[in-house]
């Protein structure tokens, strides 16, 4: 439905508050280095303009596309060239090339200072003094650090952020009330950002069909009672929403997400019995709740898949005449029967089925050729099952920190060219799969673990794409979206790697380590571990364990010493010498 003024249409649909918030998110995700005040000024100008268009849709420039309006506004930033360098060249382009250019310059790892949390009283004062600015600043700081954060979901986080301050700043013990809530929001926010980053990577690097296949599998697991036509409609709508958000079209995305939530709730009887509670909530909570809703129960009397997908005489005809529909139905039918499989496994099975049909259908006896296709699935199913079993056993034996360390060593040996901060960040996140998923019963372990690993490995892929250093990483990241995890799992020690020169400075520590939080101290130790492996890639587990145990003892000893700095200087030298001897450096 065409509107005379797109900006007026979205302003009316979303309301002023959400409109302003979404424009701020959009601008902060594009111009990640711009100061908060500059963005607020731009947002206010856009909002005032939108209001004039609401009053008169025929007013000057109101017929322009949102990309044109927003792009023109971003290109008025005076410091564009000195702050962003070649990104300023985007402004010489016309739409839609200009927006594509801005998208290509989004930085997954912007050079921004770490967000330091002020004292609770300071935060509460700021919240009370100017609630609107305080919340806008939250949106701005998250959006610029996470340029692909799912914008309508960020509005939900901001609502929870506001609620936490509203409640806790009145509490007797403000810190006890607020800090756990902020920790939870931070952790959930990071997870949400990473999940959305995978969706955008899927769309941008592998195309709409890859995303749709993922969505068919996931929604079929979640809504196994829904008909294929219903799932297909939801997939089409969901794809539109995520395509818009990943493309920077945040107003359209938020509007369409609200429409999708409305549709789902109006049709929940034909979708899922689990949606009732979600659908009673306000919009932002409703959309979030639907996105996280548990899988509905599987229909009791589902027939064997073989009838339609192996035994039917029309298998090859159906495949050849409409692959998207036929393979979509296969994926739907398989996924609704297997909530115990990861989405990526289901996609691998569908790809195997497709490849087999493509190979067999032109043969003299197609049925004979593809009759055993389901037998080909067995090793594909067993591979992640065995991997998860082994790693959960290792996790239960070691605990999270040491399990992370085992993964750090494993991944540094596989891809030692990758930067140490990236290896630490990714391996720590990979290690979290243990506490996240190993507690689940067998039937929930694989979807939890393998789909989570897909999200984490995508972080590695997007960080590596910015500064490519390893052909092996590039290969695993680009060849197949669904085979990324098996590709990384299959990598052995990189025999071509030339060990890094030993640098004593890398292993020099100071008394400031003693005041760090437990998490920060772990990161310091894990950074040292990665560097050790880069110096000595052939070091055994035992050698590395001995050095790390000595290192932990050294930190503990010096942090208890009266003259900490002297202890770190003197004992540090001894530790470096002993470690070099132990590792034969």
């Amino acid at each position: 439905d065409a509107h005379k003024s797109e900006v007026a249409h979205r302003f009316k649909d979303l309301g002023e508050e959400n409109f302003k918030a979404l424009v701020l998110i959009a601008f902060a995700q594009y111009l990640q280095q711009c100061p908060f005040e500059d963005h607020v000024k731009l947002v206010n100008e856009v909002t005032e303009f939108a209001k004039t268009c609401v009053a008169d849709e025929s007013a000057e420039n109101c017929d322009k596309s949102l990309h044109t309006l927003f792009g023109d506004k971003l290109c008025t930033v005076a410091t564009l060239r000195e702050t962003y360098g070649e990104m300023a060249d985007c402004c010489a382009k016309q739409e839609p090339e200009r927006n594509e250019c801005f998208l290509q310059h989004k930085d997954d790892n912007p050079n921004l200072p770490r967000l330091v949390r002020p004292e609770v009283d300071v935060m509460c004062t700021a919240f009370h003094d100017n609630e609107e600015t305080f919340l806008k600043k939250y949106l701005y700081e998250i959006a610029r650090r996470h340029p692909y954060f799912y914008a309508p979901e960020l509005l939900f986080f901001a609502k929870r952020y506001k609620a936490a301050f509203t409640e806790c700043c009145q509490a007797a013990d403000k810190a006890a009330c607020l800090l756990p809530k902020l920790d939870e929001l931070r952790d959930e926010g990071k997870a949400s950002s990473a999940k959305q980053r995978l969706k955008c990577a899927s769309l941008q690097k592998f195309g709409e069909r890859a995303f749709k296949a993922w969505a068919v599998a996931r929604l079929s697991q979640r809504f196994p009672k829904a008909e294929f036509a219903e799932v297909s409609k939801l997939v089409t709508d969901l794809t539109k929403v995520h395509t818009e958000c990943c493309h920077g079209d945040l107003l359209e995305c938020a509007d369409d997400r609200a429409d999708l939530a409305k549709y789902i709730c109006e049709n929940q009887d034909s979708i899922s019995s689990k949606l009732k509670e979600c659908c009673e909530k306000p919009l932002l909570e409703k959309s979030h709740c639907i996105a996280e809703v548990e899988n509905d129960e599987m229909p009791a009397d589902l027939p064997s898949l073989a009838a339609d997908f192996v035994e039917s005489k029309d298998v090859c005809k159906n495949y050849a005449e409409a692959k998207d529909v036929f393979l979509g139905m296969f994926l739907y039918e398989y996924a609704r029967r297997h909530p115990d499989y990861s989405v990526v496994l289901l996609l691998r099975l569908a790809k195997t089925y497709e490849t087999t049909l493509e190979k067999c259908c032109a043969a003299a006896d197609p049925h004979e050729c593809y009759a055993k296709v389901f037998d080909e699935f067995k090793p594909l199913v067993e591979e992640p099952q065995n991997l998860i079993k082994q790693n959960c056993e290792l996790f239960e034996q070691l605990g999270e920190y040491k399990f992370q360390n085992a993964l750090l060593v494993r991944y540094t040996k596989k891809v030692p060219q990758v930067s140490t901060p990236t290896l630490v960040e990714v391996s720590r996140n990979l290690g979290k799969v243990g506490s996240k998923c190993c507690k689940h019963p067998e039937a929930k372990r694989m979807p939890c673990a393998e789909d989570y690993l897909s999200v984490v490995l995508n972080q590695l892929c997007v960080l590596h794409e910015k500064t490519p250093v390893s052909d092996r990483v590039t290969k695993c990241c680009t060849e197949s979206l669904v085979n990324r995890r098996p590709c990384f799992s299959a990598l052995e020690v990189d025999e071509t790697y030339v060990p890094k020169e030993f640098n004593a400075e890398t292993f020099t520590f100071h008394a400031d380590i003693c005041t760090l939080s437990e998490k920060e101290r772990q990161i310091k130790k894990q950074t040292a571990l990665v560097e050790l492996v880069k110096h000595k890639p052939k070091a055994t587990k035992e050698q590395l364990k001995a050095v790390m145990d000595d290192f932990a003892a050294f930190v503990e000893k010096c942090c208890k010493a009266d003259d900490k700095e002297t202890c770190f200087a003197e004992e540090g030298k001894k530790l470096v010498a002993a470690s070099q001897a132990a590792l034969g450096l």
Partner: antibody
Framework: EVQLVESGGGLVKPGGSLRLSCAAS????????INWVRQAPGKGLEWVGI???????FYATWAKGRFTISRDDSKNTLYLQMNSLKTEDTAVYYC???????????????WGQGTLVTVSS | AIQLTQSPSSLSASVGDRVTITCQSS???????LSWYQQKPGKAPKLLIY???KLTSGVPSRFSGSGSGTDFTLTISSLQPEDFATYYC???????????FGQGTKVEIK
């Protein structure tokens, strides 16, 4: 030597019919997916249709109903029956095999030399 | 409607030049079902590349293909005298009935 040889082309009036043949030597056509591809004079390539080893046929949307592909295994020959011919069907018609291991992909490796069909009054 | 658009429609180049031909598909091809053919006057086409980037056996390594989804490229790294010909891309889609070719790119001697 493995080869495909088309025949049966010639001049035909609009509305008329023609049957093209594609004879194979060195390969057993019944083990292959075979396509017909045409090329109007001075123009590009256009896929007409395919017959799989099993005998199942598929056609380009524009060819459905007018063109029929068949095969005679005893003669190791493929046919293209063309009815209700139009002037725009004037072209060189090639038969070509799909690369083994594929059924629906546009990978055509072995080609005949082509036969010219002219539809004109 | 399915469209496979090649550009340029013709180009002039010299022996030793690097030549790039693009093929744009709407909608995206199915599962990288994209091929490249070479055709010389009066002859049948010859398959050079399949699955967007795989070289058919016997085809010189100066030919290479890349791309996925909607955008594909054929590159001849160093044009040889025998490479002057017309090049076609071929695309496969969800329905076999939509199999189609680009309109061709004629590579001529400068």
């Amino acid at each position: 030597e493995v080869q495909l040889v088309e025949s049966g082309g010639g001049l035909v009036k609009p509305g008329g019919s023609l049957r093209l043949s594609c004879a194979a030597s060195g390969i057993d056509l019944s083990n292959y997916a075979i396509n017909w591809v045409r090329q109007a004079p001075g123009k590009g390539l256009e896929w007409v249709g395919i017959i799989w080893a099993s005998g199942t046929t598929f056609y380009a949307t524009w060819a459905k109903g007018r063109f029929t592909i068949s095969r005679d295994d005893s003669k190791n020959t493929l046919y293209l029956q063309m009815n209700s011919l139009k002037t725009e069907d004037t072209a060189v018609y090639y038969c070509t095999t799909t690369v083994p291991g594929y059924s629906t992909a546009p990978y055509f490796d072995l080609w005949g030399q082509g036969t010219l069909v002219t539809v004109s009054s | 409607a399915i469209q496979l658009t090649q550009s340029p429609s013709s180009l002039s180049a010299s022996v030793g030049d690097r030549v790039t031909i693009t093929c744009q598909s709407s909608p995206s091809v199915w599962s990288n079902f994209l091929s490249w053919y070479q055709q010389k006057p009066g002859k049948a086409p010859k398959l050079l590349i399949y699955e967007a980037s795989k070289l058919t056996s016997g085809v010189p390594s100066r030919f290479s293909g890349s791309g996925s989804g909607t955008d594909f490229t054929l590159t001849i790294s160093s044009l040889q005298p025998e490479d002057f010909a017309t090049y076609y891309c071929g695309g496969g889609y969800s329905s076999i009935s939509d199999t189609t070719f680009g309109q061709g790119t004629k590579v001529e001697i400068k």
